[in-house]
């Protein structure tokens, strides 16, 4: 006999990276008929929602109107149908950005390179941080981490056209508090030959989300995105 229900999905809208003082909604999708959803933050109960009517709703939203460093961290959710509880969702890392300072991102040998050329990004921030993050716009949200006192190196190795795109970096004051994003750097990769065996796991990011949302000063900018697996967000573990 089943002792628990399947775990729900958890994600953040419009994004799991939220500028300080902006709004974010944490979504939890379970099953129709769930009478209660609980949102847990850093292992403790954070909020409860009881959908009405439960048989017509399989998703709830927890609204955070004013993001700050105290709200940044790991969230998970569970739901209940009758007396039976679900497994907990995967962890959602909610990150507060636009904290303190803005790093500088540069790329060597330059923003335009030949397919097969070795490329390295450099993220520099003169204030106290030792962890840096490099992100690329795209479909998944793999984030590269680098370390250094004021600057981190991100060697991409020999690049292919798969590396083309717009990159930004952040300084990280802790796992869930990041700086403002750097100015974007657009990497162009040209070359008549492309060897797919050199193609890396593409360090990409949801294309039209973070570039606009992270930099906007309009609090009302909200974008609805199709559900994407929260596991892509679990970059920090």
């Amino acid at each position: 006999q089943q002792q628990t229900l399947p775990k729900p999905f958890i994600w953040a809208e419009p994004h799991f990276m939220v500028p300080s003082a902006k709004q974010v909604t944490i979504c939890c999708q379970g099953n129709y008929g769930a009478v209660e959803y609980q949102l847990h933050f850093e292992g403790s109960l954070f909020a409860v929602d009881r959908p009405k009517p439960p048989e017509r709703i399989n998703k709830v939203k927890f609204y955070i109107p004013d993001m700050n460093s105290r709200m940044a961290g790991q969230y998970s959710c569970i739901y209940r149908v009758g007396e039976l509880w679900s497994e907990p969702s995967n962890l959602l890392d909610l990150v507060v950005t636009a904290m303190y300072d803005t790093p500088t991102l540069s790329v060597h040998p330059g923003p335009e390179v030949i397919s097969g050329e070795k490329v390295t990004f450099y993220c520099r921030l003169d204030t106290a941080t030792s962890m840096f993050l490099l992100l690329k716009e795209g479909r998944s949200s793999h984030v590269q981490r680098g370390y250094g006192k004021v600057q981190a190196e991100f060697p991409l190795g020999p690049v292919t056209t798969a590396h083309r795109g717009t990159y930004r970096c952040f300084g990280s004051y802790n796992n869930h508090a990041w700086s403002f994003p750097s100015e974007p750097v657009k990497l162009l990769v040209t070359g008549d030959i492309e060897n797919t065996s050199l193609a890396p796991e593409d360090p990409t990011f949801p294309a039209d989300t973070w570039g606009t949302y992270l930099l906007t000063t309009e609090t009302g900018l909200q974008k609805d995105h199709a559900l994407w697996d929260h596991t892509a967000q679990n970059l920090l573990r």
Epitope: P109, P111, E117, P158, I193
Partner: antibody, heavy 116, light 107 residues
Framework: EVQLQQSGPELVKPGASVKISCKTS????????MHWVKQSHGKSLEWIGG????????SYNQKFKGKATLTVDKSSSTAYMELRSLTSEDSAVYYC?????????WGQGTTLTVSS | DIVMTQSPATLSVTPGDRVSLSCRAS??????LHWYQQKSHESPRLLIK???QSISGIPSRFSGSGSGSDFTLSINSVEPEDVGVYYC?????????FGAGTKLELK
């Protein structure tokens, strides 16, 4: 010590082709792209194009597409540039240069003279 | 294509002078700007990379500054062996382009 040793001067007739070599030593050939630069007498420098030795990816200045072909031989750590359908306008000194960000090492230059 | 404009075309100097060579890009190239020196009948030699980064083996009297579209190569006390042509190069976008050069000569 990094060295780029180019082939000697060439005197060729109009309409002919020529292949200039650039033999490298002192570093891992496949780790840097190799570029070619033209310098006509008393003039500035013109970038012809570059090639990544590891996979042979190339990028050309539009002006030299159809004129220059860049290749490499990884086994001998040598880069080549072939110039075809030569005219007097192609008479110049041609340099190979390693791109380590900037062009940090240059060959000694190959003088090409196109004359009938 | 990014056009690199150097000025002056020729600079007549006396040993010991401090001189500044200018390079302007037709659009912003951030700090992807490199400087080369070419002496008569020699290959170009890298002097400064990424606008201001010094190169091992290059005398400390050579320095670079600037970002965006305006750049300067400075020689704080010219030596007779500094005579030659100085080129700036766009390292930002293909085609990679060079300035027409500034000829440094002794008075």
């Amino acid at each position: 010590e990094v060295q780029l040793q180019q082939s000697g001067p060439e005197l060729v007739k109009p309409g002919a082709s020529v292949k200039i070599s650039c033999k490298t030593s002192g570093y891992t050939f496949t780790e840097y792209t190799m570029h070619w630069v033209k310098q006509s007498h008393g003039k500035s420098l013109e970038w012809i194009g570059g090639i990544s030795p590891n996979i042979g990816g190339t990028s050309y200045n539009q002006k030299f597409k159809g004129k220059a072909t860049l290749t490499v031989d990884k086994s001998s750590s040598t880069a080549y540039m072939e110039l075809r359908s030569l005219t007097s306008e192609d008479s110049a000194v041609y340099y190979c240069a390693r791109r380590g960000g900037s062009f940090d090492y240059w060959g000694q230059g190959t003088t090409l003279t196109v004359s009938s | 294509d990014i056009v690199m404009t150097q000025s002056p075309a020729t600079l007549s100097v006396t040993p010991g002078d401090r001189v500044s060579l200018s390079c302007r890009a037709s659009q912003s190239i951030s700090d992807y700007l490199h400087w080369y020196q070419q002496k008569s009948h020699e290959s170009p030699r890298l002097l400064i990379k990424y606008a201001s980064q010094s190169i091992s083996g290059i005398p400390s009297r050579f320095s670079g500054s600037g970002s965006g579209s305006d750049f300067t190569l400075s020689i704080n006390s010219v030596e007779p062996e500094d005579v030659g042509v100085y080129y700036c190069q766009n390292g930002h976008s293909f085609p990679l382009t060079f300035g027409a050069g500034t000829k440094l000569e002794l008075k």
